[in-house]
């Protein structure tokens, strides 16, 4: 009798339960970027540290060749911060035909690549005009949100100008994802 | 027979399972910072509201003396926003020897202190140059990421200038962490 | 005897366990806002895409009439990014009687509405002065934190000026929440 009472309740939730500690997770940190060629009109991808310092990958979440590889389908929280730094951007000085300039800008995109799909999908974008007069400047762009991903999907972080990325400290520029 | 089939499966996942509702969690909100002395070249730590309004700590996550105390080892998502406000910062005016000024800046650091380790670890940093001409200014810096923490670790939020923190509303400046 | 040993241990964690995959979750993405009347001194709410592209709601988390409806009590992580864009804001140029102007600003608020409570609660606010000289500007405000919500609570995103919201891409402006 006791067994009969217990079984249905157990069956009701048993199948999908899984231990939190074995979920795929990664936190990647900045490394100095080696200048690389990239296609025109395509933002270059950052590469990352995946095991030293604060960085880690675990539970089958692997990092390879600028990509985080999603090992199982589910809903993931994905985040990144990129700190940019540059010299003065005198975007207010020169106007042609009375029109304001197209401003300088900095952009971060978190992109999903699915092998069976021809085009990458932009999941998150942070983009900011930069109009700093008279001094060096620096500022972060932070992004984070939840997405439904499929096993085999790949994630990368693209930036508008790799030469402006602050690669000096692992706490300034980073990229991570975890299965919810 | 049924019992024999069931036992191994149960043992397989039973040990690490735990209820989501009993995981350590905290969301702390800003209070006015009383002016206090701090060491030179060391960013002061903010103190926080931990039980009134939107603020809470639960499941053995405790707040004491500017620190969130980590009650069990695991992967935590940690976040903070600090809203800064100040008066005009005419950083573009004076250049020496044709060089741009070192700009004014605002910085937030989420720091981990481990008693067995001599130096605090900077987990997250958001830093931004401020070059606002002609008016009062205000802006937030947001940070958030996942880290592997150990029982007994302590977390704090440090800022570059405590006098520029907007302490007026609990939704503007906050700090939180939760076990994944 | 074996049953007696097993039962207490099972009872200890059984009741609150639940499958991660059936937790309420939503990620909403921007759509073009139709101009609507709103009360003076009250920020207008954005409406959202909830099923096309990257957007989804699941497990009884429903979207209706600008609100995300919370289907069960618990601790939720809530986030939003709004990208603003506008024309030059020459806030530094004109001063009356030597006094600085009140700066232009952009603000995002994530608000909770509880039917049994007369006033909405501001959970998160990101607010930034905008003083861009000489060019069009664009920039995101990102917010995210954990809150204890009750079944029936409603969440919305309010902005200071709906006409400045960049509605062009689903990765630039978004709103989400998930039960922890």
């Amino acid at each position: 009798l006791k067994g009969q009472e217990f079984a249905p309740s157990h069956q009701q939730v048993y199948a999908p339960l899984r231990a939190d500690g074995d979920k795929p997770r990664a936190h990647l940190t900045v490394v100095r970027q080696t200048p690389t060629q990239h296609f025109k009109n395509q933002f270059p991808a950052l590469h990352w540290e995946h095991e030293l310092g604060l960085a880690f990958t675990k539970n089958r979440m692997n990092y390879t060749n600028k990509f985080l590889l999603i090992p199982e389908s589910g809903d993931y929280f994905i985040y990144s911060q990129v700190t940019f730094r540059g010299m003065t951007s005198e975007c207010s000085e020169i106007r042609q035909a009375g029109r304001p300039n197209k401003p300088d800008s900095i952009t971060v995109v978190i992109t999903k690549v699915t092998d069976s799909y021809p085009e990458p999908t932009q999941l998150l974008m942070g983009t900011k005009s930069v109009c700093e007069v008279g001094s060096n400047w620096f500022q972060p762009i932070y992004l984070g949100a939840m997405f439904s991903l499929q096993e085999g999907d790949k994630l990368m972080v693209n930036v508008s100008d790799i030469s402006l990325v602050d690669y000096t400290k692992e706490d300034k520029t980073f990229f991570g994802a975890f299965l919810l | 027979l049924k019992g024999q089939e069931f036992a191994p499966s149960h043992q397989q996942v039973y040990a690490p399972l735990r209820a989501d509702g009993d995981k350590p969690r905290a969301h702390l909100t800003v209070v006015r910072q009383t002016p206090t002395q701090h060491f030179k070249n060391q960013f002061p730590a903010l103190h926080w509201e931990h039980e009134l309004g939107l603020a809470f700590t639960k499941n053995r996550m405790n707040y004491t003396n500017k620190f969130l105390l980590i009650p069990e080892s695991g992967d935590y998502f940690i976040y903070s926003q600090v809203t800064f406000r100040g008066m005009t910062s005419e950083c573009s005016e004076i250049r020496q020897a044709g060089r741009p000024n070192k700009p004014d800046s605002i910085t937030v650091v989420i720091t981990k202190v481990t008693d067995s380790y001599p130096e605090p670890t900077q987990l997250l940093m958001g830093t931004k140059s401020v070059c606002e001409v002609g008016s009062n200014w205000f802006q937030p810096i947001y940070l958030g990421a996942m880290f592997s923490l150990q029982e007994g670790d302590k977390l704090m939020v440090n800022v570059s200038d405590i006098s520029l923190v907007d302490y007026t509303k609990e939704d503007k400046t906050f700090f939180g962490a939760f076990l994944l | 005897l074996k049953g007696q040993e097993f039962a207490p241990s099972h009872q200890q964690v059984y009741a609150p366990l639940r499958a991660d995959g059936d937790k309420p979750r939503a990620h909403l993405t921007v759509v073009r806002q139709t101009p609507t009347q709103h009360f003076k001194n009250q920020f207008p709410a954005l409406h959202w895409e909830h099923e096309l592209g990257l957007a989804f709601t699941k497990n009884r988390m429903n979207y209706t009439n600008k609100f995300l409806l919370i289907p069960e009590s618990g601790d939720y992580f809530i986030y939003s990014q709004v990208t603003f864009r506008g024309m030059t804001s020459e806030c530094s140029e004109i001063r009356q009687a030597g006094r600085p102007n009140k700066p232009d600003s952009i603000t995002v608020v994530i608000t909770k509405v509880t039917d049994s409570y007369p006033e909405p609660t501001q959970l998160l606010m990101g607010t930034k002065s905008v003083c861009e000289v000489g060019s069009n500007w664009f920039q995101p405000i990102y917010l995210g934190a954990m809150f204890s919500l009750q079944e029936g609570d409603k969440l919305m995103v309010n902005v200071s000026d709906i006409s400045l919201v960049d509605y062009t891409k689903e990765d630039k402006t978004f709103f989400g929440a998930f039960l922890l």
Epitope: - | R32, Q33, T34, P35, T36, Q37, H38, K40, R85, G86, M87, N136, D161, I162, S163, L164, V165, D166, Y167, T168, K169 | -
Partner: antibody
Framework: EVQLQESGPGLVKPSETLSLTCAVS????????WAWIRQPPGKGLEWIGD???????NYNPSLKSRVTISVDTSKNQFSLKLSSVTAADTAVYYC???????????WGQGTLVTVSS | AIQMTQSPGTLSLSPGERATLSCRAS??????LAWYQQKPGQAPRLLIY???RRATGIPARFSGSGSGTDFTLTISRLEPEDFAVYYC?????????FGQGTKVEIK
Amino acid sequence: EVQLQESGPGLVKPSETLSLTCAVSGVSYSDYHWAWIRQPPGKGLEWIGDINHKGKTNYNPSLKSRVTISVDTSKNQFSLKLSSVTAADTAVYYCARDYPNFLFDYWGQGTLVTVSS
Amino acid sequence: AIQMTQSPGTLSLSPGERATLSCRASQSVSSHLAWYQQKPGQAPRLLIYGASRRATGIPARFSGSGSGTDFTLTISRLEPEDFAVYYCQQYADSPLTFGQGTKVEIK
């Protein structure tokens, strides 16, 4: 435009309570703390204390036992009460806005309070 | 409480000259120091905060420097409207305290 205006009696008898009010206009009251500062004739400035829109106060320890600062958000005003006054409390009393934090960027024009019998 | 001491008590200068005012704290206040200007019959006006940051709308001839215990306010070329009393204020510790003032008068 931010404006602060002090009001209250200019003469108070010794041992009585000095009461002043500051009316605030042109600004969101809840975004700041609001302070009282005084200046005895020909002397320097002394911070008395401050308050926010929720009524949370900070007082100068040297005056704490005699000072009460209160707020009436419906009227956008805050008040100072200083009990058991003596001639040493004779001063110009200013109200001021605290921005961004423990600095005073807008001031009232000040009101002279004389303590005399 | 932190004591703030200003020197000199009075500074007699002509328009166009450079004025240098000093403020010393009894213990370190880091860079949490402000300067105010007060003219007769008027309320004080915030000039400098953070030891060296000019407040909104303050002319560039006013500059501040120093950190720790010793601070300086400099007026590069005195204008007629600059003759007034100047106060320093520390906001590193509670209670907030002001110096006794330096009067800048026309020579």
